[in-house]
Structures are given as structure tokens and as C-alpha cells.
Interface confidence: low
């Protein structure tokens, strides 16, 4: 239907800032009725383009801990198992919105951030350079 | 590391839910010097896993626009250009954090939610089951 | 290309009845909620009337309450202006425009896509 | 008469900041975010600005806007010839229950 006018039991904002300051409940609500395939898939290993997960820490953070895909080889796993470097394990990249603690160290003040994460990888075709 | 004292500047917080709701401040820092990869690049048309960027909107989230990676195949692209259906396009899934307007329809008072989205596409070897 | 071509404009008597379309093509017109908005000579923009994405809810200014009907064929991608009793002040550019969300939503998104528009003139 | 004030009119000089306001009222600004709509003279008006300062793919990041309270502005930081136009912020006002353009503001590059 039509966009509801605003919900009378909004909070007021008497913030200058308004709306660039906002209150968030960090009680996460999960809209995945399923556990997160990333961890429960073993796509990593399987992959032509396998990867390793490392674990990036920052208490400072909102969610505090984060899983960097990093792509184990230049090249990608042909057939034979072997790793052909005609091909390329390329990172696949995503910004993801995080919350920064601002002031350094308050509990209940954060900036929303934008970071850079590799979810995984994938083969891609390299381009090539031709010298004339 | 150690867990650093409170800063003494932080915002006090008398609400009754604290820490569960805080503030948040909109103004997104970008920690990423460069463009967003996953724009810039054209892994989604070179993998051996290619795979469509599709617009998924919703004003009721911040942020508003997510992009969301459909295979274009069930098979991998092989050396000749053609669909190899021995082997699997998957995609690669991330939890995300995006903020929900609660109350609807309010502009200053989110939840934070976690939502799956699909990042890009990656080809693995299809698990085979064996029947006796 | 996204694209919205409104037809039916013209010169018409004051208490007299037209009809005025627009053409959708270059995305999935029933997924978007749609306005139209006019602009009177030497004025600024006036809303007139928003249409949900299915037809279900309809919006209208006051100043055109109960004389325009808003409507939408979303089997010929087509929003309609059906506007009855035209008045002088009615004289105005008439565009349609699409909501920047899919959905239920008719404002977080602004309308990102307009067409050219369409002249009304009512007048004896 | 508009639900949304805007001042008749604005200008600078190239490169030069100009500010722009445009104030309602617990209905409709109070309630609801901002978008922005520029208008070149004989052309059909161009989405500049919408939800939390969030700006379509093409329009310059010379452009921003703030909100607070009852009012908005938009700023144009950089003024160049090509920002000559008509500005007009619109929202959604409740107690019309629809949707409301500001009176308009427009921008002389000097």
C-alpha cells in the first residue's frame, strides 16, 4: 500500500544533528532462516579458486569480528588438481557497513563505517597486455 | 588487545535499554581509498562463474540500495567458452549488517538486522553422491 | 532506457474533461508506484496525485480532489490522469513521474525518472 | 501556498558556495527526509537528492545536503555555470497526505 505517514510512537530527535545522528537498537535481528552457508558450505576448499578464512579483530568495531577471504594461489585448479596460471584466483570484494566506536572507547557512541571485505574467490580470464 | 578505559568524553547514556540502544552517526567514514572493487571491476563478466548484479531497494533499510550477484549458469564457463555443467556455479554468501527503521516509518530510530547477500560467484567441483 | 512519454495535452473549455497518458518502458512499471505533477506557466512544481504499484491506493492533492481520477494498466504500461470539471487554474505542464523504489514506498527514493511532459490549457 | 518555504532566490560567483533552506513543519520535514530537485529552464526536473543525503548515480558530490528539525538545506559547494536552475526540496506531508514541493529557489551563477 501507500508509504504510512510517520509512526506516532517515533522517538523525538532534539539532536542538531538530526537525522545524521540516529538511535539503534543492537539487539540484531536475524532476517537468515538458515546459519550463514559462508561458514556451514565448504565452497573455500572446493572452489578453482580455493581460499583460506583469517580472522580480523578490532574491538573498536561493531561487529568486532570479521573473516577475510584471502585466494591461495595465483592461478586457478584445473582438472588434474594442478594450478594453471593461464587463469586467475581473483578476491571478490564487498563494502560492508560496520559500526565505529566515536569517541575512542565509549560504549554507547558509534560513526557508522564503511570497509572493505574479500568474501571469496572466483577464477577469472587475466587480461592480457599485448606489446607492440 | 587490552580493554582500554572509558573515554571520559563519551555521550552519558540514562537509557533504560543501554547498551542495547545507542547513537549512531550517519556521516559514514569510507576507509576505503580506493573505488568499490566490486563496481570497478569486471570480475562479474571474466569468472569462470559470471554472474548478474541485481538492484535490491527498500527505504525502510540504510543502506537503501543493496546489489545482489545472481550465476548466470548452473555450469562453469571451460576453455572453449561453453558451459561445463561437471562442474558448479555457486554463489558466495556474506552476512551483512543494515540498519531497519523501528518504528517503521520513522527516520531517526533504527535496528541493526543481519541479512544475506550474495556476493559474486565462484565455480567448485559438484559433490557426486554414490548410490549403492 | 528508462523512459516515461505523457500524451494528451491540449486546449480544452473550462468545465470540460480530458484524459492524459503516459507511456512506460525501459523497467517494470508494475513494480513502481507513480505520480503525476504539474507546473503552471512562470511556476513552480505542484504534486497532483500518486498511484500505488498495483493500482491499490491512490493520493491526491487538494486542489484536484474528487474532479481527477488517477489510474494505472500495468498490462500496457500506462498510468492515466483522468481529469473532469477543468478549471483555468488547472493550465499547467502535466508530468508523470516514477518513484526511485520498487514497492510500497512513494517518497524515501524521490522520483527519479520523468517524462517531458504534457501542456493542458484550459480556457473559453 | 506551499507546505515547504524556500527563498526566491540564490547566487554566487563560480566556484563560490551557495546554500539553499527550505522549512516546514512537524508534518512533513519533521517527519520525513528531504529529497532535492533541480530544474534547468524548458527541461522536466532531475532528482538531485534523496533519503539520508544519498545522491543518484551522475549527480556530483558537489552537492549536500543537511537536515534538522522542521528545515533542510541544500548546499551547492563549487558553483559552476551549469548549476543555473530552479531548486525545490519536496517530502511527504502527513496532515496532506501527500506529497509536497517547496516554492523553489532559483540559483544565478554571477
Known amino acids: 500500500g501507500i508509504t504510512i505517514p510517520r509512526n506516532p510512537g517515533c522517538p523525538n530527535s532534539e539532536d542538531k544533528n538530526f537525522p545524521r545522528t540516529v538511535m539503534v537498537n543492537l539487539n540484531i535481528h536475524n532476517r537468515n532462516t538458515n546459519t550463514n552457508p559462508k561458514r556451514s558450505s565448504d565452497y573455500y576448499n572446493r572452489s578453482t579458486s580455493p581460499w583460506n578464512l583469517h580472522r580480523n579483530e578490532d574491538p573498536e568495531r561493531y561487529p568486532s569480528v570479521i573473516w577475510e577471504a584471502k585466494c591461495r594461489h595465483l592461478g586457478c585448479i584445473n582438472a588434474d588438481g594442478n594450478v594453471d596460471y593461464h587463469m586467475n584466483s581473483v578476491p571478490i570484494q564487498q563494502e560492508i557497513l560496520v559500526l565505529r566506536r566515536e569517541p575512542p572507547h565509549c560504549p554507547n557512541s558509534f560513526r557508522l563505517e564503511k570497509i572493505l571485505v574479500s568474501v571469496g574467490c572466483t577464477c577469472v580470464t587475466p587480461i592480457v597486455h599485448h606489446v607492440a | 588487545g587490552i580493554t582500554i578505559p572509558r573515554n571520559p568524553g563519551c555521550p552519558n547514556s540514562e537509557d533504560k535499554n543501554f547498551p542495547r540502544t545507542v547513537m549512531v552517526n550517519l556521516n559514514i567514514h569510507n576507509r576505503n581509498t580506493n573505488t568499490n572493487p566490486k563496481r570497478s571491476s569486471d570480475y562479474y563478466n571474466r569468472s569462470t562463474s559470471p554472474w548478474n548484479l541485481h538492484r535490491n531497494e527498500d527505504p525502510e533499510r540504510y543502506p537503501s540500495v543493496i546489489w545482489e550477484a545472481k550465476c548466470r549458469h548452473l555450469g562453469c564457463i571451460n576453455a572453449d567458452g561453453n558451459v561445463d555443467y561437471h562442474m558448479n556455479s555457486v554463489p558466495i554468501q556474506q552476512e551483512i549488517l543494515v540498519l531497519r527503521r523501528e518504528p517503521p516509518h520513522c527516520p531517526n530510530s533504527f535496528r541493526l538486522e543481519k541479512i544475506l547477500v550474495s556476493v559474486g560467484c565462484t565455480c567448485v567441483t559438484p559433490i557426486v553422491h554414490h548410490v549403492a | 532506457e528508462v523512459q516515461l512519454l505523457e500524451s494528451g495535452g491540449g486546449v480544452v473549455q473550462p468545465g470540460r474533461s480530458l484524459r492524459l497518458s503516459c507511456a512506460a518502458s525501459?523497467?517494470?512499471?508494475?513494480?513502481?508506484?507513480m505520480h503525476w505533477v504539474r507546473q503552471a506557466p512562470g511556476k513552480g512544481l505542484e504534486w497532483v496525485a500518486v498511484?500505488?504499484?498495483?493500482?491499490?491506493?491512490?493520493y491526491y492533492a487538494d486542489s484536484v480532489k474528487g474532479r481527477f481520477t488517477i489510474s494505472r494498466d500495468n498490462s500496457k504500461n500506462t498510468l492515466y490522469l483522468e481529469m473532469n470539471s477543468l478549471r483555468p487554474e488547472d493550465t499547467a505542464v502535466y508530468y508523470c513521474?516514477?518513484?526511485?523504489?520498487?514497492?510500497?514506498?512513494?517518497?524515501?527514493?524521490?522520483?527519479?525518472?520523468w517524462g517531458q511532459g504534457t501542456t493542458v490549457t484550459v480556457s473559453s | 501556498q506551499s507546505g515547504l518555504t524556500q527563498p526566491p532566490s540564490a547566487s554566487g560567483t563560480p566556484g563560490q558556495t551557495v546554500s539553499i533552506s527550505c522549512s516546514g513543519s512537524?508534518?512533513?520535514?519533521?517527519?520525513?527526509?528531504v529529497n532535492w530537485y533541480q530544474q534547468v529552464p524548458g527541461a522536466a526536473p532531475k532528482l538531485l537528492m534523496y533519503?539520508?543525503?544519498q545522491r543518484p548515480s551522475g549527480v556530483p558530490d558537489r552537492f549536500s545536503v543537511s537536515q534538522s528539525g522542521t528545515s533542510a538545506s541544500l548546499a551547492i559547494s563549487g558553483l559552476q555555470s551549469e548549476d543555473e536552475a530552479d531548486y525545490y526540496c519536496?517530502?511527504?506531508?502527513?496532515?496532506?497526505?501527500?506529497?509536497?514541493f517547496g516554492s523553489g529557489t532559483k540559483v544565478t551563477v554571477l
Open positions: 525501459g523497467f517494470i512499471f508494475s513494480n513502481y508506484g
Open positions: 513521474a516514477k518513484v526511485g523504489a520498487s514497492g510500497d514506498y512513494y517518497y524515501s527514493y524521490g522520483l527519479d525518472v
Open positions: 498511484i500505488s504499484y498495483d493500482g491499490s491506493n491512490k
Open positions: 519536496a517530502t511527504w506531508d502527513d496532515s496532506l497526505g501527500g506529497y509536497v
Open positions: 512537524n508534518s512533513n520535514i519533521g517527519s520525513h527526509s
Open positions: 533519503g539520508i543525503g
